[in-house]
Interface confidence: low
């Protein structure tokens, strides 16, 4: 676009301009080529010879313009057409500037300390007769010239006359500029354009409002000569929270929302999320939602899963070893990464469950106590005439780093019993007579600790050959036996349970099985022998 | 035996660096997800930061978010803090814990961090 | 940030008495709260898990209470080596968050 400096048309007052010698330029009235009225400027001082008419504009501003345009329209009269004037008529005119940094006032044109810089001598391409000013025929010339680059606020032109019969119509003054404008959400300047014939300018944007740049490296273009823009390069993206509508950013609405500039358009926020305000960055989970720290603002919010569904475990009593196995929780909490840990407490045999400590170190987990993707667990190192509370509890990625303690755990309780804690190699043969056997064992329970006292060992023994139906039994209360009417020299088959009285009694299983062969007839005992 | 053993405490200016170490031993260290705490001088105990056994998932107090990072290498048996920019108000003794599901049920000595010019 | 608030922040017992030592949450934990004692010079010890569970090695008189956002610790009759410092401490949120303390001193 172009940006006016001066233009002598659109003055509809005197323009007051200075001339010297006062016989010289003179303003006048007149129209234009639409019959607008105009202020023009004219001499025809052609008869005389030795003109040196001057005629001074007033100051005109350059405003941020370095290269100016001047464009002139004038008349000019044909030397030949006038008699008398061929040796002092002229038909060109000369055109000057005078930079200065304020108005030198209405007075004698200053026209500076040094000479005013010449921009042109200006001819005429067309010029009218006197036939032609009797029929009306103003054959109008227009003229542009380029001055500066200009350093100073602002300049004076200044019009020589120096013998011919012009008129100046109008007088333009100004400089081109890119206009302002808006590309790539960056804002540019209204810049003004160099000359043709220098480089391109250019100028840093800068991002609208609620948008950002590459860090360092602000969008840019240039500023052509004819003031276009060219050469976009680089642009603003909007900020998070943020999107693009035409120019500007908007801020996402509600149930919407941006994390980075790198996106172009607001989200609806993830399914269990709310952005409640405008221009957020992130959805907030609803409650009992959230995210983990690996999840992207772009995941669902999830929540904890259900405790583990069907939690079954299985007991064997020699070893003494704990089997659990559980189907997944019914709701996973909108996650794939369950996983599953386990807690050990051991309770006192009687009382409340609450009456539990953690298991210790002694107990040990297969595969692992916590972390498990498996679906199964194994527990070692129980101790016997114990009861056993294992929470499994399921996690995923939002259950936080104690959430095993919360409630989306299930539970067993376990009472590994006295059972028949005893290897094969645990119970002894003290004894070995033709008609009797004499065995002992580990008590299951320390001397001395809860339940010690009350235990009861049930022997059941049979011919080894015969059906395990036909076995005869022996009871005792201490952790030795001694079985008699045996036979002699034959294979026998003890068992062995240990339990207190009561109703468990049942439940307990005979194991280990040893083998003894009583002594023929003609054999003396064998005391303390190894073990078997 | 269970232990835990702390080292990497120190004085340093503000704005400095520090990194606290946490060797285990006597249990299965990637079983179980590790704390620090810290105790400013004279004070009561803060939890700083916690890391899941895998290494997986990492939470951290607001008073260092940012600037504090949690990890562990499981082939070593170690936990660490690396701690940045830190503060005056970062001076303290900062203890590992052991996350024994649900409390902390091993505790590191601690080690002294003094941050000082 | 659940914030825990102990109270008294001391209290002054003699030998063989009852101490009660209270602990309130601004939000309710459920039962995720834990009591630890805390001597001078030494990490802290687990004392009380899942607000009413005793841990390993810890005397049937220290005793826990409380659900949701009101708790206590009770240790019915005091002996020397419990006077200490104790501290709550939730875990029912990823912000773990320990109480002020109350330092139990003998009277």
């Known amino acids: 676009e172009e940006v006016i400096l001066l233009d002598s048309k659109a003055s509809q007052a005197e323009l007051g301009w200075t001339a010297l010698p006062s016989n010289g330029w003179e303003e006048i009235s007149g129209v234009d080529e639409h019959d607008r009225p105009i202020r023009t400027y004219q001499v025809c001082n052609v008869l005389e010879p030795n003109q040196d008419n001057w005629l001074q504009t007033g100051w005109i501003s350059r405003g941020r313009g370095q290269r100016i345009f001047v464009e002139l329209q004038f008349t000019l009269r044909d030397c030949s057409s006038i008699p008398g004037a061929a040796g002092t008529c002229k038909e060109t005119f000369n055109v000057y500037y005078l930079e200065t940094e304020a108005d030198l006032g209405r007075g004698r044109p200053r026209l500076g300390g040094s000479r005013p810089r010449k921009i042109d001598t200006i001819a005429a391409d067309e010029s009218f007769t006197q036939g032609d000013l009797g029929e009306r025929k103003m054959k109008l010339n227009t003229e542009v010239r380029e001055i500066g680059p200009l350093s100073r606020r602002g300049f004076h032109l200044a019009f020589q006359d120096v013998g011919a019969c012009v008129a100046l119509v109008s007088v333009r003054v100004y400089y081109k500029q890119c206009r302002a404008t808006v590309r790539g959400l960056a804002t540019f300047p209204a810049t003004a354009a160099e000359s043709a014939f220098s480089t391109l300018v250019e100028v840093a944007g800068t991002c609208v409002a609620h948008s950002e740049g590459e860090p360092g490296s602000p969008p840019r273009m240039h500023c052509g000569a004819d003031g276009e823009w060219l050469v976009p390069v680089g642009r603003c993206s909007c900020s998070a929270g943020f999107q693009e509508r035409g120019d500007f950013c908007e801020a996402c609405p509600p149930g919407f929302y941006k994390v980075s500039p790198r996106r172009p358009l607001c989200s609806p926020c993830p399914e269990h999320s709310r952005a409640l305000e405008n221009a957020s960055t992130f959805c907030v989970c609803q409650d009992s939602y959230a995210r983990s720290p690996t999840d992207p603002p772009s995941a669902s919010c999830t929540r904890p899963p259900s405790a583990p569904r069907d939690l079954q475990y299985s007991l064997s009593r020699s070893p003494l070893v704990l089997r659990l196995r559980w189907l997944p929780p019914a709701d996973s909490g909108g996650r794939s990464d369950v996983t599953y840990s386990l807690l050990c407490l051991r309770c006192g045999r009687e009382g409340p469950a609450g009456a539990c400590e953690p298991c210790g170190p002694r107990v040990a987990f297969l595969p692992r106590q916590a972390g498990l993707r498996e679906r199964a667990a194994t527990l070692l190192h129980l101790r016997p005439g114990a009861r056993y509370t294992v929470r499994v509890a399921a996690l995923n990625g939002v259950s936080g780093p104690a959430a095993a303690a919360g409630t989306t755990y299930a539970q067993v309780t376990v009472s590994t019993g006295p059972g028949a804690p005893w290897e094969e190699d645990e119970i002894r043969r003290d004894r070995v007579e033709p008609q009797s056997v004499s065995l002992s064992w580990r008590e299951p329970i320390p001397a001395g600790a809860p339940g010690a006292n009350d235990t009861e060992y049930e022997i059941r023994y049979y011919e080894k050959g015969q059906s395990e139906q036909t076995y005869s039994m022996v009871k005792t209360g201490a952790p030795t036996v001694t079985v008699t009417n045996l036979k002699p020299a034959t294979r026998y088959v003890f068992q062995i349970r240990a339990a207190s009285p009561g109703p468990s009694w049942e439940a307990q299983s005979f194991n280990p099985s040893i083998e003894v062969q009583t002594l023929g007839e003609a054999a003396s005992g064998s005391r303390d022998q190894s073990p078997a | 035996e269970v232990q835990l053993v702390q080292s990497g405490g120190g004085v340093v200016q503000p704005g400095g660096s520090l990194r606290l170490s946490c060797a285990a031993s006597?249990?299965?260290?990637?079983?179980?997800?590790m704390h620090w705490v810290r105790q400013a001088p004279g004070k009561g105990l803060e939890w700083v930061a916690v890391?899941?056994?895998?290494?997986?998932?990492?939470y951290y107090a607001d008073s260092v978010k940012g600037r504090f990072t949690i990890s562990r290498d499981n082939s070593k048996n170690t936990l660490y803090l690396q701690m940045n920019s830190l503060r005056a108000e970062d001076t303290a003794v900062y203890y590992c814990?052991?996350?024994?599901?649900?409390?902390?049920?091993?505790w590191g000595k601690g080690t002294l961090v003094t941050v000082s010019s | 940030e659940i914030v825990l608030t102990q109270s008294p922040a001391t209290l002054s017992v003699s030998p063989g008495e009852r101490a009660i030592l209270s602990c309130r949450a601004s939000?309710?934990?459920?039962?995720?709260l834990a009591w630890y004692q805390q001597k001078p010079g030494q990490p802290p010890r687990l004392v009380i898990y899942?607000?009413?569970s005793r841990a390993t090695g810890i005397p049937a008189r220290f005793s826990g209470s409380g659900s949701g956002t009101d708790f206590t610790l009770t240790i019915s009759s005091l002996e020397p080596e419990d006077f200490a410092a104790y501290y709550c401490?939730?875990?029912?949120?990823?912000?773990?968050?320990f109480g002020g303390g109350t330092k139990l001193e003998i009277k």
């Open positions: 814990a052991r996350d024994g599901l649900p409390a902390f049920d091993i």
């Open positions: 006597g249990f299965t260290f990637d079983d179980y997800a």
């Open positions: 890391i899941s056994y895998d290494g997986s998932n990492k």
């Open positions: 939000q309710s934990v459920r039962s995720n």
């Open positions: 899942d607000a009413s």
């Open positions: 401490q939730q875990y029912g949120s990823s912000q773990l968050t």
